[in-house]
Amino acid sequence: WELTILHTNDVHSRLEQTSEDSSKCVNASRCMGGVARLFTKVQQIRRAEPNVLLLDAGDQYQGTIWFTVYKGAEVAHFMNALRYDAMALGNHEFDNGVEGLIEPLLKEAKFPILSANIKAKGPLASQISGLYLPYKVLPVGDEVVGIVGYTSKETPFLSNPGTNLVFEDEITALQPEVDKLKTLNVNKIIALGHSGFEMDKLIAQKVRGVDVVVGGHSNTFLYTGNPPSKEVPAGKYPFIVTSDDGRKVPVVQAYAFGKYLGYLKIEFDERGNVISSHGNPILLNSSIPEDPSIKADINKWRIKLDNYSTQELGKTIVYLDGSSQSCRFRECNMGNLICDAMINNNLRHTDEMFWNHVSMCILNGGGIRSPIDERNNGTITWENLAAVLPFGGTFDLVQLKGSTLKKAFEHSVHRYGQSTGEFLQVGGIHVVYDLSRKPGDRVVKLDVLCTKCRVPSYDPLKMDEVYKVILPNFLANGGDGFQMIKDELLRHDSGDQDINVVSTYISKMKVIYPAVEGRIKAHHHHHHHHHH
């Protein structure tokens, strides 16, 4: 019996087609992805093959103005239109709290939404009961297939699930659900979830009875043969894991942003064992036409977005200096504003010992593309912010050693004075540079804001300590020459859309007046600072 698994993950509100790098589509003839194009390909496969499942491994939420405006209603609507068969909850599905998941998505999806390792307690338990499930048995042709869901255990640190959801260890939670499916005589079981490629592989290895793992969260691109676009494969598709009980378990993921449609064909024997598996992600490029009826629907929903982007979010009573003359040379108040918004967006009081789990922010000055003038009645709109942050990136959470941060700050000024983008703006960090010293040895003081404290204060950076830092995905991926971050990071979780973070902060504050306040200091002559 042959099953075709079509899968997406980490689509992050790319409902419209995008450019090759998943940012805004500029030249339509070269654009990719989007739900209208995805539908064309899915329908083509459904017509050609008998047993097809369309699955999503989480993080449909968050990423473009579509989510900012429609708050998940767009996800339910278009996933229903594409007739997804099942979805696993990702961490970003909790970005607007549990209510922001229940109302727009859980109540409106016409397909099951899954996670076995999220347990509701207290008053939420009855409210959310039955709206998401640990597993689902799906009829496929004359057979049934079991799907078990899972979600990153880190979600409380990455999103806003509130206090009434407990995120359990994935493997511990999945095993009894798989066992339950076995007792129902369901012998073909797919684990569908959102915990990253490393955990996907562990699930394949450790959870008895799982035949296939379809994952997300780490935006992993797998490919067999010559890859069709710019993504470099992390391994073959499918990636085969040998389980502890000696079975070969295919593990797949399909990069992100709806750029590819994962396509995996599995052959099962009559006892539900995998005999063979093969496939590849399908690049959704312009050779695949956009479905006209879905496209028309997208255009109808688009209208509200254009109206939204010119509405006032809040006011500034000071000039927001986002000029390259400032942000690439010294502390600029636009950089301070953005970093403050980044920290504010990551307030998660999950432990009595810590006022917050993260206090530090770094931001490449070159990522700030425009100032905002306060003399326009102080008004700030989404459109204004899109000029400041035009790349459609995310503000991510990483864990780094102090020594890596020190290297990053040395890199920040290694060729100071040439208006290069790597000059870092900061939050929760006080840095002093001596620019008369040789490159690689210019950081003379680096103090960081404590987290395990009731009164936050600045302490010298410790080289061997592990710190959490919020930064643009561009930096986490080694952009602007920050190779040390990419190479040495201990953990990386993708965060919220950059513009969305700043716009939410401005709306919350109503009136803003960020100052230049001595977070970054530099001098050009030898001084009596001692080395740390």
């Epitope: 007739r83 068969d85 109540k107 409106e108 999806a109 016409k110 397909f111 099951p112 039955g130 499930l133 689902k136 048995v137 799906l138 009829p139 496929v140 049934v144 129902l184 005589n185 369901v186």
Partner: nanobody, 124 residues
């Protein structure tokens, strides 16, 4: 929470009719496939009939084809099973069940929510 409550069961003579109702609360009916199942004493639970979420397709077990009709009133959040020409072998506890998805099925394993059941006895 999601709930299904069956009613309309009872004692009926062979050749008689009954209409079972399944009232659904806590969710929008038009998002759910609804199935009727029955369990005779000492036997496995068997699928009798089901109706797709859209109401556009209905399926029946061979044993009831032409005698039973499933229908739904989404406005009243209720699903009905009209049972005509009843036979003694139709005796059992009748359950209604629901699940979200695109493909209606008579396989009990795909149903996530179940009512408590209503008893039907066909006897002279």
């Amino acid at each position: 929470a999601l709930q299904l409550v069956e009613s309309g069961g009872g004692l009926v003579q062979p050749g008689g009719s009954l209409r079972l109702s399944c009232e659904v609360s806590g969710f929008t009916l038009d998002y759910y496939n609804i199935g009727w199942f029955r369990q005779a004493p000492g036997k496995e639970r068997e699928g009798v009939s089901c109706s797709s979420a859209s109401g556009g397709s209905t399926y029946y077990a061979d044993s009831v084809k032409g005698r039973f009709t499933i229908s739904r009133d989404n406005a009243k959040n209720t699903v009905y099973l009209q049972m005509n020409s009843l036979k003694p072998e139709d005796t059992g506890v009748y359950y209604c069940a629901a699940y979200r998805g695109w493909h209606p099925s008579l396989d009990a394993r795909v149903y996530d929510y179940w009512g408590q059941g209503t008893e039907v006895t066909v006897s002279s």
